[in-house]
């Protein structure tokens, strides 16, 4: 049975230019991650792998850094980076758990965090 | 240039375990990732495990109380040890070589590969 | 498991032709495909990862499209060299599997 939770940094908001911390955390679960894949809709993003590191897809290498942790951060923003952001945790042995995360960028200065939320 | 070769036994009984050799030249095995993966006869190829930089192996969950993935980096070696082989193991086993950071888990230096037949 | 199905075993085509080989996963695999090709005495070579990227020194008439679960690989502009086996692998998850091969022929 699975009964870990997701949490993530819910509906955020980020500047045109600018850069933003994409992070999920799974709580409630003994469960070993083994990997940790990171999508934007079909697009991989990247992959942070429990024995071998961290994988940036080479359509977003230019763009994207690993970390904090098994987070990711966006930088160089476009109004096209507007959109669903999955974090899919791998785990043994419960199974794959996925959290999304709305990213709204901006044009305007004003760019505020939305609120956590939490995915079962 | 990076060369692997793989050596082993050619022949097995059932209920023997064979021990298979990857030798690396021209690289060291302290970078990267270091996997086998076999064909059967019509084509049909099974990946079975790696070994990483670090030493962390990962098996195939069909394989994994049967395989054994070690490494002997003084020699550039790595070894497959597969237990209790039926006739179903007869197949080409090949090692391959994996950079996780810039193509994932695509493998893309493979040795010539060495065939095992079980027949008692 | 994700399952690889490569629905043809076996294309035939000609010297010249456009030839397109399709994969398809069990699941969504987002872009995590790399394609093989395997001729005849020889052991596999990466052609292809991250679905479209082509490896160090493959030839541009070698292509690789697709996203989530359907994947096509395809040859531009066929070469008698280019009798082989072709197979797509996915890496989004352990264990990382493979398609079942498709044998390209040349007429």
């Known amino acids: 049975m699975m009964t870990g939770t997701i949490e993530t940094t819910g509906n955020i908001s980020a500047e045109k230019g600018g850069s933003i911390i994409l992070q999920c955390h799974l709580s409630s679960t003994t469960a070993q991650v083994t990997q940790v894949n990171w999508e934007q809709q079909d697009q991989l993003l990247a992959i942070c792998n429990a024995d071998l590191g961290w994988h940036i897809s080479p359509s977003f290498k230019d763009r994207v850094a690993p970390g904090p942790g098994l987070g990711l951060t966006l930088q160089s923003l476009t109004v096209n980076d507007t959109g669903e952001y999955f974090c899919i945790y791998h785990t043994y042995p419960d199974g794959t758990y996925t959290g999304r995360i709305f990213l709204e960028v901006l044009e305007s200065s004003v760019a505020e965090h939305g609120a956590r939320f939490q995915i079962p | 240039e990076v060369q692997l070769q793989e050596s082993g036994p050619g022949l097995a009984k059932p209920s023997q375990t064979p021990s298979l050799t990857c030798s690396v030249t021209g690289y060291s095995m302290t970078s990267d990732y270091w996997n086998w993966i076999r064909k059967f006869p019509g084509n049909k190829l099974e990946y079975m495990g790696y070994i990483s930089y670090s030493g962390r192996t990962y098996y195939n969950p069909s394989l994994k109380s049967r395989i054994s993935i070690t490494r002997d980096t003084s020699k550039n070696q790595f070894y497959l040890q597969l237990n209790s082989v039926t006739t179903e193991d007869t197949a080409t086993y090949y090692c391959?070589?994996?950079?996780?950071?810039?193509?994932?888990?695509?493998?893309?230096?493979w040795g010539q590969g060495t065939s095992v037949t079980v027949s008692s | 498991d994700i399952v690889m199905t490569q629905s043809h075993k076996f294309m035939s085509t000609s010297v010249g032709d456009r030839v397109s080989i399709t994969c398809r996963a069990s699941q969504g695999v987002s872009t995590t495909i790399a394609w093989y090709q395997q001729k005849p005495g020889q052991s596999p070579k990466l052609l292809i990862y991250s679905a479209s990227y082509r490896y160090t020194g493959v030839p541009d008439r070698f292509t690789g499209s697709g996203s989530g679960t359907d994947f096509t690989f395809t040859i531009s502009g066929v070469q008698a060299e280019d009798l082989a086996v072709y197979y797509c692998q996915q890496y989004y998850s352990s264990p990382f599997t493979f398609g079942g091969g498709t044998k390209l022929e040349i007429k």
């Open positions: 391959a070589r994996g950079d996780y950071s810039n193509y994932g888990g695509a493998m893309y230096d």
